[in-house]
Amino acid sequence: RDKVMSEFNNNFRQQMENYPKNNHTASILDRMQADFKCCGAANYTDWEKIPSMSKNRVPDSCCINVTVGCGINFNEKAIHKEGCVEKIGGWLRKNVLEQKLISEEDLGGEQKLISEEDLHHHHHH
């Protein structure tokens, strides 16, 4: 489990680096952040470390009320501050790892550590 979570953490951070450059990656991270009400890997401040992202910006999917541009010049009270790795990781342990192996699909050359099916399942519960 720890190995899986460590890989998921590394993968999530790697995909954050790709966020501004890859629309497919961006849409998957946006889906995760919106569905799990989280922002960044450890927390929302991870986004300010992404070189090609403006330091006063997080993805709109971090917003509590998602609207176009809501992540620009954000206020902490308007975004989800908790990190996604811990939040999704807890959900994975509870709902997925106990039941089955995590699906591994290609995501920009990286292993995808959470399947669309799992996300869909979370979204409807």
Partner: antibody, heavy 119, light 108 residues
Framework: QVQLVESGGGLVKPGGSLRLSCAAS????????MNWIRQAPGKGLEWVSY????????YQADSVKGRFTISRDNAKNSLYLQMNSLRADDTAVYYC????????????WGQGTLVTVSS | DIQMTQSPSSLSASVGDRVTITCRAS??????LNWYQQKPGKAPRLLIY???SLQSGVPSRFSGGGSGTDFTLTISSLQPEDFATYYC??????????FGQGTRLEIK
């Protein structure tokens, strides 16, 4: 009503230090980013530093980086600016400014406190 | 960094005149543009936020327009209390937060 009251300004020699304070009242302090903005005599407005609601994010202008430190005490509804290695070109009125963020602009400003750096 | 350039840097006008001040950003800032008024010895006061929204308590003779890189502040009919210095400021990309150099509005 919203009030921002700065204090701590004064005359200091080059290389010296000062600590500015800003007492906030009339609003929920933790709902806002806070800024220090300065204005040298007869000059325009210059952003100095900002700090996020919780204090997790802090940035300074390049002109003060490594010399000025912004902080806040949310329990005391107070904002601070520790200014070290002061130079003559730091002479200015320093304003404590409330920032709702997004596209709303700086909606409340303190009256300012004058810092004079001179030998 | 995004540079903000105001024009003119000073302007003389009479009571009742219509006055327009312009502000240009070095790159697109969408509508993340604010206008402030400052009178001598006083703190600045927010007039317009989000390029065109009037701040509460500001007279309706003030209006803002534009988006992207070019913005305007218009005073439809100058009043004696409007003679002051006006600044634009962008909040789209920071740090740093940047202001225009100011436009001084004087009585003709």
């Amino acid at each position: 009503q919203v009030q921002l009251v700065e204090s701590g300004g004064g005359l200091v020699k080059p290389g010296g230090s000062l600590r500015l304070s800003c007492a906030a009242s009339g609003f929920t302090f933790t709902d806002y980013f806070m800024n220090w903005i300065r204005q040298a005599p007869g000059k325009g407005l210059e952003w100095v530093s900002y700090i996020s609601n919780s204090g997790a994010i802090k940035y300074q202008a390049d002109s003060v980086k490594g010399r000025f430190t912004i902080s806040r005490d949310n329990a005391k509804n107070s904002l601070y600016l520790q200014m070290n290695s002061l130079r003559a070109d730091d002479t200015a009125v320093y304003y404590c400014v409330r920032d709702p963020r997004s596209y709303y602009g700086f909606d409340y400003w303190g009256q300012g406190t004058l810092v004079t750096v001179s030998s | 960094d995004i540079q903000m350039t105001q024009s003119p840097s000073s302007l003389s006008a009479s009571v009742g005149d219509r006055v327009t001040i312009t502000c240009r950003a070095s790159q697109s800032i969408r509508n993340f543009l604010n206008w402030y008024q400052q009178k001598p010895g006083k703190a600045p006061r927010l007039l317009i936020y989000a390029a065109s929204s009037l701040q509460s308590g500001v007279p309706s003779r003030f209006s803002g327009g534009g988006s992207g890189t070019d913005f305007t502040l218009t005073i439809s009919s100058l009043q004696p209390e409007d003679f002051a210095t006006y600044y634009c400021q962008q909040s789209y990309s920071n740090p740093p937060i940047t202001f225009g150099q100011g436009t001084r509005l004087e009585i003709k």
